[in-house]
Interface confidence: low
């Protein structure tokens, strides 16, 4: 059976930690978990999200001993069958951006723009300065929009 | 290949003690969970004990049925399992298969109590 | 403890026809989106033969024949094209939680 395309899922004692399976699981392409089949080592029962396998599984029903995540360094927020954590995201200050909610071992950072800075695209890698007015603000600048310039010359109301 | 082979059983006395033993192979014996599964004649599969790796600190877990009369234990340097059967009843009589948690079982060796 | 039931108790089915087991579980045996759940087929004087594992994963060496399905608390054996080899008792089993607990059995006969 070690040929067989497993998975790994144990979850036998659930109560008691829980972190037992076998065959573990077992193949589960159906059911997307991450990092379930490697090199033909599987382990029977994932672990769960701000876990890691410390080690990896020789054989169908072989434990997977779960450690938690390096704690505001690593997370995983799926339950997965994988010896690594994902890393924390950066928040580039360089790239205009800070933190809003801090890396916990099961979600990752989440990051915002700085103040005065911008980003008006869904998925923001930098944010971009907000521009400063000579002539006046018709619209302030916002976490995702521009500031709006009046333009030399435009009365004003 | 893995393989399991029971063996241990008899004939015993109601009351009476047995200790069942399960030698395993072609797998790394140390890191796996194991369990004890038994089967009555004509009747369906009950689990009745488990024991987790060094690493799991060799918890154990019984069915109701066998709490404080069945001790399951294992020899990792001889990787091998056993099932320690005290006050032994007649509802006991049955196959007794090692089991991994990969779902292997072995061929089962037979226990039968009965005055 | 999960209680298995498994329906029906016995089942005759002609030769080449489709047969279908169910099980049902007491209550979910679902972790984290993995249902564990086994089938088994067991012949007289044999241990349980694993069959499926984690609800629809086909053991290796198992005829195609063979499928799982399900999830939660609800699953299903299908043997697509009855066998005379398939005559045997049937057994699920969930390992979500200890105890490890089993359907009844399902007899399937040829008929």
């Known amino acids: 059976r070690l040929s067989s395309k497993s998975v790994n899922a144990q979850v036998t004692d659930i109560n008691s930690k829980g972190l037992e399976l076998r065959k573990t699981v077992t193949t589960v392409e159906t059911q997307n978990l991450e990092g379930l089949h490697h090199d033909g080592q599987f382990c029977h029962k994932p672990c769960p999200p701000g876990e890691r396998k410390a080690r990896d599984c020789t054989v169908n029903g072989d434990e997977p001993d779960c450690v938690p995540c390096q704690e505001g360094k690593e997370y995983t927020d799926k339950a997965h069958f994988s010896s690594k954590c994902r890393r924390c995201r950066l928040c580039d200050e360089g790239h205009g951006l800070e933190v809003e909610i801090n890396c916990t071992r099961t979600q990752n950072t989440k990051c915002r723009c700085k103040p005065n800075f911008f980003c008006n695209s869904t998925v923001c890698e930098h944010c971009d300065p907000c521009t400063k007015c000579e002539h006046g603000i018709i619209k302030e600048c916002t976490l995702t929009s521009n500031t709006k310039c009046k333009e030399e010359g435009s009365r004003s109301n | 290949e893995v393989q399991l082979v029971e063996s241990g059983g008899g004939l015993v006395k109601p009351g009476g003690s047995l200790r069942l033993s399960c030698a395993a192979s072609?797998?790394?014996?140390?890191?796996?969970?194991m369990n004890w599964v038994r089967q009555a004649p004509g009747k369906g599969l009950e689990w009745v004990a488990r024991i987790r790796s060094k690493s799991n600190n060799y918890a154990t877990y019984y069915a109701e049925s066998v709490k404080d009369r069945f001790t399951i234990s294992r020899d990792d340097s001889k990787n091998t399992l056993y099932l320690q059967m005290n006050s032994l009843k007649t509802e006991d009589t049955a196959v007794y298969y090692c089991v991994t948690d990969g779902y292997y079982w072995g061929q089962g060796t037979t226990l039968t109590v009965s005055s | 403890d999960i209680v298995m039931t498994q329906s029906p108790d016995s089942l005759a089915v002609s030769l080449g026809e489709r047969a279908t087991i169910s099980c049902r579980a007491s209550?979910?045996?679902?972790?984290?989106?993995?249902?564990?759940m086994q089938w088994y087929q067991q012949k007289p004087g044999q241990p349980p033969k694993l069959l499926i594992y984690v609800a629809s994963n086909v053991e290796s060496g198992v005829p195609d024949r063979f499928s799982g399905s399900g999830s939660g608390t609800d699953f299903t054996l299908t043997i697509s094209s009855l066998q005379a080899e398939d005559v045997a008792v049937y057994f699920c089993?969930?390992?979500?939680?200890?105890?490890?607990?089993f359907g009844q059995g399902t007899k399937l006969e040829i008929k």
């Open positions: 072609g797998f790394t014996f140390n890191t796996n969970a």
């Open positions: 209550e979910s045996v679902e972790y984290y989106g993995t249902s564990l």
């Open positions: 089993q969930q390992s979500t939680k200890v105890p490890w607990t």
